[in-house]
């Protein structure tokens, strides 16, 4: 799915407003220099590419976290924002949570979503020079 | 069982603001967008905005920006629509729709109206 | 003025089938698969009849149906019956910031 066209001020609205503070709660306990931030992104749109495919397509040792609460505000946020989004990725996306077994917090989906955060801070500051 | 249940009619002067409140019951509220669209007597539906709220952020219709406020409140799991600097031409049914989980733009459960009327 | 150009009204005799329009342009209708059809009785609230151009919700009989040419979309009803008197609304979704649009309405009359 091509991101370019998405309404960003709504979507980092959603992010400020709510999206951010679930993902501090999935976070709770765990120190902010646990991880280094591996995953980066150069532009809006490209955040937005590895913002959908961290949140929504299963890795090794974090099998989905398509159930969260910040995964599920993130794609009704694509939803409505990026036009074309539903038809394409909410089926696959509702496939993966299908399949899911049981909610486990592994260290591997710790990491995961500490390079979230990263990503979307990185989304929300897309004028800053890429380190 | 599944329903958008508004609040009663409301007669209004020019000028004054009318909050309008639909209450959700038999769905989970709160990934479902829930959009306004309103009647004017003998006329066609107008869209005026939209909000989903587990996100919070609404969308207005231009012709209403500024002058349309939507809310949730995804406790009581009631969404509402306030529209300020009322004119005779807002004299309307206003309904609550729900837009399906995930595809907001299409409206598959409706409330049953709201009829505000702005008179002097 | 609706951004959206349906007819102001259609008719036919009972069993007979009746085509409503709705014509939009690239930004609307031409450019998403988001139409959507909602039948209107007086004094009742809309009711979705189709959606993403030809799909039917459960309980809508498949007498009706939806297609999509560019930019025009329509409605047609088939074996038309008296209970199918309505006022008949499209919609398209029209990107972010205008989201909905919706047409004037067709008022269908069975004779």
């Known amino acids: 799915y091509d991101f370019t066209n998405c309404d960003f001020e709504k979507i980092k609205a959603a992010y400020l407003s709510t999206i951010s503070k679930d993902l501090i709660t999935y976070m709770s306990g765990t120190k902010s220099t646990e991880f280094n931030n591996t995953v980066s992104c150069s532009n809006r749109p490209h955040c937005l590419t590895e913002i959908q495919s961290l949140t929504f397509n299963p890795t090794a040792g974090c099998a989905s976290l398509a159930k969260e609460m910040f995964a599920m505000k993130t794609k009704a946020a694509l939803a409505i924002w990026c036009p074309g989004y539903s038809e394409t990725q909410i089926n696959a996306t509702q496939a993966m949570k299908k399949r899911r077994k049981r909610k486990v917090t592994t260290n591997k989906c710790l990491e995961q979503v500490s390079q979230l955060q990263g990503l979307w801070r990185r989304f929300n500051r897309p004028l800053l020079k890429q380190q | 069982q599944v329903q958008l249940v508004q609040s009663g009619a409301e007669v209004k002067k020019p000028g004054s603001s009318v909050k309008v409140s639909c209450k959700a019951s038999?769905?989970?509220?709160?990934?479902?967008?829930i959009s306004w669209v309103r009647q004017a007597p003998g006329q066609g539906l107008e869209w005026l905005g939209v909000i989903i709220p587990l996100l919070g952020v609404p969308n207005y219709a231009e012709k209403f920006q500024g002058r349309v406020t939507i809310t949730a409140d995804t406790s009581t799991s009631t969404a509402y629509m306030e529209l300020s600097s009322l004119r005779s031409e807002d004299t309307a049914v206003y309904y609550c729709?729900?837009?399906?989980?995930?595809?907001?733009?299409?409206?598959?459960?409706w409330g049953q109206g709201t009829l505000v009327t702005v008179s002097s | 003025q609706s951004a959206l150009t349906q007819p102001p009204s259609a008719s036919g005799s009972p069993g007979q089938s009746v085509t409503i329009s709705c014509t939009g342009s690239n930004s609307d209708i031409g450019g998403y698969n988001r139409v959507s059809w909602y039948q209107q009785h007086p004094g009742k609230a809309p009711k979705l009849m189709i959606y993403?151009?030809?799909k039917r919700p459960s309980g809508v009989p498949d007498r009706f149906s939806g297609s999509k040419s560019g930019n025009t979309a329509s409605l047609t009803v088939s074996g038309l019956q008296a209970e199918d008197e309505a006022d008949y609304y499209c919609?398209?979704?029209?990107?972010?910031?205008?989201?909905?649009?919706f047409g004037g309405g067709t008022k269908l009359t069975v004779l």
């Open positions: 993403e151009i030809s």
């Open positions: 729709a729900r837009g399906a989980e995930y595809f907001y733009w299409y409206f598959d459960l």
């Open positions: 919609s398209s979704y029209a990107g972010t910031d205008t989201f909905v649009l």
């Open positions: 038999g769905f989970t509220f709160g990934s479902y967008g």
